[in-house]
């Protein structure tokens, strides 16, 4: 029972994970600026892996999408590429921890497939959540360095002179989303990897062999070691070994002329 | 690289109109606020007027009435129309627009080199 609960638990921390690292990624709001020198309007900025938006204190608000791949940098494309993976592994997780659920009876599965079904789910969480919390903290990282370079770049073109505007970088909603998001997941897929081991069959049943001699039959347990006369108090041989599993132990057994070897 | 290129700028009489353009262009992904500074010899530099990205609109006192500022997204480009110009605003006319910039991810204050007003009979 603590097994089946571990597993659900798991699985629905999972799930709402990997719901949070999918809302992270979509979400606009991996960064926010404040432009406070602004000469004409407050002008708040924000972005996310795809698209960056301005609003004006007067309302107006505008997104506009990267729709090119090669001015953007290379941390930017990397960051997507580990929410990518982190959003594709947990989506494949989810799947194959459905059917390794216990409480869910699909044909005359074996608890063992079960097991390893429930272990490959519980490794691909842990990996989707790494991924999401290393996405997350290599763009944070990325904001924190332009917030210290931002005071050294400054250089004359030929059209006059550029300078980095005077921004106050600040986190945005999607970096905390993304952070939990991704512990969420890791911590299901914990879960679902020690809910494994309480799945897997922890020891091999054996069966009896029984070996009769001609006059005494000496039943030889490999599993016990204990041997018993076919006469007498023991004549029904007592199971030694009880796994689950019917033995010919379990049948009366007689000494006779014909019994062999 | 990015830059803005201001013209329209010359001689004219007091009483007279001029339309100075900024145009901003190279790899800029968005340009947020245009603003217009002048400076005059041997003086401080100083807003004329500003407009942002959604229309919001600054204007110095000693302008309001007379100059209207007026930008077109599509073309990153900004227009100061001057009418009833005096001998006071005779200036050197820049250029300043805010691009934000996806390549650093950070905001871009663009000048550029000035065109020159002088209003004079």
């Known amino acids: 029972m603590a097994v089946t609960a571990c597993q659900g638990l798991g699985f629905v921390v999972s799930l709402i994970g990997i719901a949070g690292i999918i809302a992270a990624t979509c979400m606009d709001q991996w960064s926010t600026q404040d432009l406070y020198n602004n000469p004409v309007t407050a002008v708040f900025n924000y972005q996310g892996l795809w698209r960056s938006c301005v609003r004006e204190s007067s309302g107006f608000t505008e997104c506009r999408g990267y729709f090119t791949l090669l001015g953007l940098p290379a941390m930017l494309q990397a960051v997507r590429a580990l929410m990518i993976v982190g959003i594709v592994l947990g989506a494949i997780g989810l799947l194959v921890s459905i059917f390794a659920l216990k409480c869910i009876r699909i044909g005359s599965m074996e608890d063992s497939a079960k097991a390893n079904m429930t272990l490959t789910s519980g490794i691909m969480f842990i990996v989707s959540g790494l991924c999401a919390i290393a996405g997350v903290s290599v763009f944070a990282n990325m904001l924190v360095t332009n917030f210290w370079m931002s005071t050294a770049n400054m250089y004359t073109g030929m059209g006059g002179m550029v300078q980095t505007v005077q921004t106050r970088y600040t986190f945005g909603a999607a970096l905390f989303v993304g952070w939990v998001a991704g512990g969420l997941t890791l911590i299901g897929g914990v879960m679902m990897c020690i809910a494994c081991r309480g799945l897997a069959p922890e020891e091999t049943n054996y069966k009896a062999v029984s070996y009769h001699a001609s006059g005494h039959s000496v039943a030889y347990k490999p599993g016990g070691f204990k041997a018993s006369t076919g006469f007498g108090s023991n004549t029904k041989n007592k199971k030694i070994y009880d796994g689950g599993a019917r033995t010919e132990d379990e049948v009366q057994s007689y000494p006779s002329k014909h019994d062999y070897v | 690289e990015v830059q803005v290129v201001e013209s329209g700028g010359g001689l004219v009489q007091p009483g007279g109109s001029l339309r100075l353009s900024c145009a901003a262009s190279g790899n800029i992904f968005r340009i947020d606020t245009m603003v217009w500074y002048r400076q005059a010899p041997g003086k401080q530099r100083e807003l004329v007027a500003g407009i942002s990205r959604g229309g919001t609109t600054n204007y110095a006192h000693s302008v309001k009435g007379r100059f209207t500022i007026s930008r077109d997204n599509a073309k990153n480009t900004m227009y100061l129309q001057m009418n009833s110009l005096k001998s006071e605003d005779t200036a050197t006319y820049y250029c300043?627009?805010?691009?934000?910039?996806?390549?650093?991810?950070?905001?871009?204050?663009?000048w550029g080199q000035g065109t020159l007003v002088t209003v004079s009979a």
């Open positions: 300043n627009a805010q691009a934000w910039d996806v390549g650093t991810i950070r905001y871009l204050e663009v």
